[in-house]
């Protein structure tokens, strides 16, 4: 069954945590649907964003952080492992110095920690997708 | 009650027709939610687009057409009559030479006909909004 979109969940992240998302674009790639995943510093959607991951399906991915209300230097990738009309599985793993983003089991993007992952309090998944799975796994201490 | 998004409806347009849409952005303007309205030449979403109207709430509006699969010259406006967190009523009227877009009763954008409005067969409303009303009114002959 489908999860509501935008989908918001409280989360605490640290090295070893993984956020897993399963979904499908709501439109063909010609129409450029988006997927966005934001790791927020508060439970409020207007809070700062530790890691902003935005896919414009078929075109590009941008990653960034929003600090004290201001967007910082954007990192852009043309790598596009997502398939038109197909379900995707996205996993974002917290490594010691960066986030590693896997798409369908394939390492696709990285983003260095600008802000401690421990500052994350909420994850939001939204834009032009249907969402079937959201999970945060925590490393066993 | 809410209409599904993306929302797709068959439509035939000509001078005097008006498309009316009521909805609300799904996120605060800081997060840049989008609204998109596309007038298609076929019932298929990958068909050409006679009039493409995209709002990046709080930032800008772009208008364009997609002809034989290719986007044409984009028209951009910084006019932003939409209010953060507020419901909007959008009406797109087919005038003899252009589309006139009204936001909350205020004339806000125009777009000259590049393709005959009679070529429109379907309207799609989508992206980051909840939708409460969609109506196409036809001029009484």
């Amino acid at each position: 069954s489908l999860l509501p979109v935008p989908y918001t969940e409280a989360a605490s992240l640290s090295t070893g945590s993984t956020v897993t998302i399963k979904g499908r674009p709501l439109a063909c790639f010609l129409n450029e649907p988006y997927l966005q995943v934001d790791f927020h510093t508060e439970m409020k959607e207007e809070s700062d964003i530790v890691f902003h991951f935005q896919v414009c399906f078929g075109r590009r991915v941008v990653m960034n952080s929003r600090e004290y209300g201001a967007w910082k230097q954007q990192v852009e990738s043309k790598n596009m492992p997502f398939q038109d009309g197909q379900e995707f599985e996205l996993s974002i793993s917290v490594l010691p110095d960066k986030y590693q983003v896997m798409v369908n089991g394939q390492s696709s993007y990285t983003f260095d920690h600008r802000i401690k992952p421990e500052a994350v309090k909420m994850v939001q998944v939204w834009r032009d997708i249907s969402l079937t799975k959201f999970n945060v796994s925590y490393l066993k201490r | 009650s809410l209409l599904p998004v993306p929302y797709t409806e068959a439509a035939s347009l000509s001078t005097g027709s008006t498309v009316t849409i009521k909805g609300r952005p799904l996120a605060c303007f800081l997060n840049e939610p989008y609204l998109q309205v596309d007038f298609h030449t076929e019932m298929k979403e990958e068909s050409d687009i006679v009039f493409h109207f995209q709002v990046c709430f709080g930032r800008r509006v772009v208008m364009n057409s997609r002809e034989y699969g290719a986007w044409k010259q984009q028209v951009e406006s910084k006019n932003m009559p939409f209010q953060d967190g507020q419901e909007f009523e959008l009406s797109i009227s087919v005038l003899p030479d252009k589309y006139q877009v009204m936001v909350n009763g205020q004339s806000s954008y125009t777009f000259d006909h590049r393709i005959k409005p009679e070529a429109v067969k379907m309207v799609q409303v989508w992206r980051d909004i909840s939708l409460t009303k969609f109506n196409v009114s036809y001029l009484k002959r």
Partner: antibody, heavy 121, light 107 residues
Framework: QVQLQESGPGLVKPSQTLSLTCTVS??????????WSWIRQPPGKGLEWMGA???????YYSPSLKSRTSISRDTSKNQFTLQLSSVTPEDTAVYYC?????????????WGQGTQVTVSS | HSAVTQPSAVSVSLGQTARITCQGG??????ASWYQQKPGQAPVLVIY???ERPSGIPERFSGSSSGDTATLSISGAQAEDEADYFC??????????FGGGTHLTVL
């Protein structure tokens, strides 16, 4: 082993432009995701970050020095250069170049040995 | 004027534990780094990511952070640890800010 070496004039007259170059060996300045900074230390004082150039060529500047600072690079020589305009005696300092492997606000793991710059007429 | 403040001087008896604090930083959000600087030399990184130690740095150096304070600890301080110590963090991810420095004297 990464090494950084600063070079430039030891003496600059007030109102002139100071130009310093950092030559990097043992690693490329275009390697993801390294940031290459200039940091200075006035005599008997603390460290002041001035600005940086990223692996991508993007530049970043300290708000207090932004109007006078420019950082550029020459990838063929594996060098990056600081230009500081309209210098005054307050710009007298030891100037260091340094590398941050994960971001400007992160740790600086390699430093040059520093070059003394005196601003005087 | 630094956004983060350090005591100008700290003294410790040989073999005891020295603690140097860095206040006013946004350490809940940005990592703290610590540098040791001896006269006439460039700074050397001794702690990064709040508490990590680069290879070659003795185990007696450790770090921690909480809220707006980061702390460098040197347990069993040695004579060669006498130096200036600087903390560093960020006001945001696109700049770096250093504390004013602390001179450690080993008695």
């Amino acid at each position: 082993q990464v090494q950084l070496q600063e070079s430039g004039p030891g003496l600059v007259k007030p109102s002139q432009t100071l130009s310093l170059t950092c030559t990097v060996s043992g690693g490329s300045i275009t390697t993801n995701y390294y940031y290459w900074s200039w940091i200075r230390q006035p005599p008997g004082k603390g460290l002041e970050w001035m600005g940086a150039i990223a692996y991508s060529g993007s530049t970043y500047y300290s708000p207090s020095l932004k109007s006078r600072t420019s950082i550029s690079r020459d990838t063929s020589k594996n060098q990056f250069t600081l230009q500081l305009s309209s210098v005054t005696p307050e710009d007298t300092a030891v100037y260091y170049c340094a590398r941050a492997p994960y971001g400007i606000s992160r740790e600086y793991d390699y430093w040059g040995q520093g070059t003394q710059v005196t601003v005087s007429s | 004027h630094s956004a983060v403040t350090q005591p100008s001087a700290v003294s410790v008896s040989l073999g005891q534990t020295a603690r140097i604090t860095c206040q006013g930083g946004k350490f809940g959000r940005y990592y703290a780094s610590w540098y040791q600087q001896k006269p006439g030399q460039a700074p050397v990184l001794v702690i990064y990511k709040d508490s990590e130690r680069p290879s070659g740095i003795p185990e007696r150096f450790s770090g921690s952070s909480s809220g707006d304070t980061a702390t460098l600890s040197i347990s069993g301080a040695q004579a060669e640890d006498e130096a200036d110590y600087f903390c560093q963090s960020g006001r945001s991810s696109d700049n770096a800010v250093f504390g004013g420095g602390t001179h450690l004297t080993v008695l």
